[in-house]
Amino acid sequence: HSDGIFTDSYSRYRKQMAVKKYLAAVLGKRYKQRVKNK
């Protein structure tokens, strides 16, 4: 079993955290926009 076949669990964790951060930023931006538009 070559290491290259797999993405290791830490790399997957980092990607998940990056996605979470991105979504939080996008959703936060949308929320601020909605508040501003009211």
Partner: antibody, heavy 117, light 112 residues
Framework: QSVEESGGRLVTPGTPLTLTCTAS????????MIWVRQAPGEGLEYIGF??????NTYYASWAKGRFTISKTSTTVDLKITSPTTEDTATYFC?????????????WGQGTLVTVSS | DIVMTQTPASVSGAVGGTVTIKCQAS??????LSWYQQKPGQPPKLLIY???TLASGVPSRFSGSGFGTEFTLTISGVQCDDAATYYC??????????????FGGGTEVVVK
């Protein structure tokens, strides 16, 4: 590059104690850090870890509520919330390389905590 | 939490001989397992990670194998300096296993 634990001492049961892991020559925000303990003559017991980048913490089931891991820009702290005599051990911190998947290559020498009345 | 079971608890090997230590995980951890050597009064030293990759500066007489739940550490051509306690550690972190990285109970290697 090194990590060093400090803060170990003799405490009475129930007295909270905070241990500190200080990193030299490394930016803690790039690494996963774990705390491990070893009672006299016993094996290694995993406590928990903090992703020093985002501050997320995770604990072994037995350690939840008994320990709190936190960080500053240069240190990672382990608080023993209400020590009992069973918490007498040498406490180690270790750094992932950079995460956990490649094991933990950098360890401190440990700090001894003795809990006794 | 994942449970790591190491066998035997103690093993004796002759200088120049071969010693084998086994580690079993309670669920699949793929190849994300490391091995450490610890001598009295010292912190653990990383020997092998990703089940079979030798850490920097570790002699080639140490080797690791395994995948999933069964893993082996082999010391070929045992030397006096190899007398120590050896630990395996899970390094497979997922939300499901709560990112917990436990150790096996340890194996004491006595060199004759």
């Amino acid at each position: 590059q090194s990590v060093e634990e400090s803060g170990g001492r003799l405490v009475t049961p129930g007295t909270p104690l905070t241990l500190t892991c200080t990193a030299s020559g490394i930016d803690l925000s790039s690494y996963a850090m774990i705390w491990v303990r070893q009672a006299p003559g016993e094996g290694l017991e995993y406590i928990g870890f903090i992703d020093a980048g985002d501050g997320n913490t995770y604990y072994a089931s037995w350690a939840k509520g008994r320990f709190t891991i936190s960080k500053t820009s240069t240190t990672v702290d382990l608080k023993i919330t209400s020590p009992t005599t069973e918490d007498t051990a040498t406490y180690f911190c270790a750094r992932g390389d950079p995460g956990w998947s490649n094991g933990f290559a950098l360890w401190g020498q440990g700090t001894l905590v003795t809990v006794s009345s | 939490d994942i449970v790591m079971t190491q066998t035997p608890a103690s093993v004796s090997g002759a200088v120049g001989g071969t010693v084998t230590i086994k580690c079993q995980a309670s669920q699949s951890i793929r190849n994300e397992l490391s091995w450490y050597q610890q001598k009295p009064g010292q912190p653990p030293k990383l020997l092998i990670y990703k089940a079979s990759t030798l850490a920097s500066g570790v002699p080639s007489r140490f080797s690791g194998s395994g995948f999933g739940t069964e893993f082996t550490l082999t010391i070929s051509g045992v030397q006096c300096d190899d007398a120590a306690t050896y630990y395996c550690q899970n390094n497979y972190g997922t939300r499901r296993n709560n990112y917990v990285f436990p150790f096996g109970g340890g194996t004491e290697v006595v060199v004759k």
